[in-house]
Interface confidence: medium
C-alpha cells in the first residue's frame, strides 16, 4: 500500500533570465527512494539515481544544475520554460510517486512564489 505523499513547491513564478529551484519532498513513507526523474511535459530533464548519481538530459545540460538535494535548478529562464514539471520518485517497495509543479516565467520584474501543496 502506498502511504507516502509528495510535497512540492506548487505553482511558482520567476523572472525571465533568472533561476528557479524545483523541489519535491516525499514524506509519510519508509520506502527507499531508488531514483528521482525530473520531466517537463513528456521530456526527461534529469535523473538522480540513488547509487549512481545525477545525469542531465542533453537538451538541458547548459541550463540545468543538479540539486539542491533531489531538487533541480533551472537557469537562464525563458518564457518557453513556462509549463508543468514533474518529479517522479521511484521507490521500493511502494512504487512510483509523482509530484507536479507549474512554473510561469514572467517578463515583468514582479514574480511571486505560490504556496506549497501536497499530492497524495
Amino acid at each position: 500500500m502506498m502511504t507516502g505523499t509528495i510535497e512540492t513547491t506548487g505553482n511558482i513564478s520567476a523572472e525571465k533570465g533568472g533561476s528557479i529551484i524545483l523541489q519535491c519532498h516525499l514524506s509519510s513513507t519508509t520506502a527507499q527512494v531508488t531514483q528521482v526523474n525530473w520531466a517537463q511535459q513528456d521530456q526527461l530533464l534529469a535523473i538522480c539515481n540513488a547509487d549512481l548519481g545525477w545525469h542531465i538530459s542533453p537538451s538541458f545540460k547548459d541550463r540545468v544544475a543538479p540539486g539542491p538535494g533531489l531538487g533541480l535548478t533551472l537557469q537562464s529562464l525563458t518564457v518557453n520554460d513556462t509549463g508543468e514539471y514533474f518529479c517522479i520518485y521511484h521507490t521500493y517497495p511502494d512504487g512510483t510517486y509523482t509530484g507536479r509543479i507549474f512554473l510561469e516565467v514572467l517578463e515583468s520584474s514582479v514574480a511571486e512564489h505560490g504556496a506549497r501543496f501536497q499530492i497524495p
Epitope: N49, D51, L52, H55, P58, S59, H90
Partner: antibody
Framework: EVQLQQSGPELVKPGASVKISCKTS????????MHWVKQSHGKNLEWIGG????????SYNQKFKGRATLTVDKSSSTAYMELRSLTSDDSAVYYC????????????WGQGTSVTVSS | DIVMTQSHKFMSTSVGDRVNITCKAS??????VAWYQQKPGQSPKLLIY???YRYTGVPDRFTGSGSGTDFTFTISSVQAEDLAVYHC?????????FGGGTKLEIK
C-alpha cells in the same frame, strides 16, 4: 581517445567464479559511472549493473544481485566484475560500457570478454 | 522491470530503401531511449540517445523519434554497411533494459 580494454576469454567450470577487468584510458575515471552488460547467443543484451567509481556506489539488476560484484581500482582506472556460482546459462560475452555524463546511454564499450562455463 | 519489445527480429531491405525499426516500452520512459548498432563480432555502437539525439559522428541518415512508450529508429537510405543488429535500450529507470534486437538484412 577514450578506450576500455577488457581481459581475455575465460573457460571456467560450473560452480566456479570469474573476475573480468576493464582498464580505461583517455578520460577521468572517477567522472563517469561504469556499467556491465551481458550478451547471450550474440543477440540479447542484459544490464548487470553499474558502479560510481567516485564513491563506490553500485546499482545491480536484481537478477544478478548477490552473484555479481562490481568494484573499481581508482589508482589504475580499472573496473572489475566478479560473477560467482557460474552455470552454463552464464556462458556469454560480457561488456564493460561507459555512459556519457548526460544520461545512461552507453557511448563507449569494451571489446567484450567471452566466458564459457563448461565441465 | 520495463520490457522493451522490438517486434521484428529480422527485417529485409534493399540498398537505398528507407527502413523503420520500432521499439515499444511496457510503460512510459519519457524520452530516455537509446539505439545501438552491432555488427557481427563487434561491440555495440551508440547511434541515438535520448530518443532523437544523434551521437557524435553518426551519419545523418540515422534518426530516432518517439516519446512515452513508442519509439522508432529510421535509416533514410540504407547502405550495404548498415547490415547489423539494432538494439533499443531504455535509460529511464534501473534496471536499464534492452530490446531483443532487430537484424537488418540486405537483399
Amino acid at each position: 581517445e577514450v578506450q576500455l580494454q577488457q581481459s581475455g576469454p575465460e573457460l571456467v567450470k560450473p560452480g566456479a567464479s570469474v573476475k573480468i577487468s576493464c582498464k580505461t584510458s583517455g578520460y577521468t575515471f572517477t567522472e563517469y559511472t561504469m556499467h556491465w552488460v551481458k550478451q547471450s547467443h550474440g543477440k540479447n543484451l542484459e544490464w548487470i549493473g553499474g558502479i560510481n567509481p567516485n564513491n563506490g556506489g553500485t546499482s545491480y539488476n536484481q537478477k544478478f544481485k548477490g552473484r555479481a560484484t562490481l568494484t573499481v581500482d581508482k589508482s589504475s582506472s580499472t573496473a572489475y566484475m566478479e560473477l560467482r556460482s557460474l552455470t552454463s546459462d552464464d556462458s556469454a560475452v560480457y561488456y564493460c560500457a561507459r555512459p556519457g555524463w548526460y544520461n545512461y546511454a552507453m557511448d563507449y564499450w569494451g571489446q567484450g570478454t567471452s566466458v564459457t562455463v563448461s565441465s | 522491470d520495463i520490457v522493451m519489445t522490438q517486434s521484428h527480429k529480422f527485417m529485409s531491405t534493399s540498398v537505398g530503401d528507407r527502413v523503420n525499426i520500432t521499439c515499444k516500452a511496457s510503460q512510459g520512459v519519457s524520452t530516455a531511449v537509446a539505439w545501438y548498432q552491432q555488427k557481427p563480432g563487434q561491440s555495440p555502437k551508440l547511434l541515438i540517445y535520448s530518443a532523437s539525439y544523434r551521437y557524435t559522428g553518426v551519419p545523418d541518415r540515422f534518426t530516432g523519434s518517439g516519446s512515452g512508450t513508442d519509439f522508432t529508429f529510421t535509416i533514410s537510405s540504407v547502405q550495404a554497411e548498415d547490415l547489423a543488429v539494432y538494439h533499443c535500450q531504455q535509460h529511464y529507470i534501473t534496471p536499464w533494459t534492452f530490446g531483443g534486437g532487430t537484424k537488418l538484412e540486405i537483399k
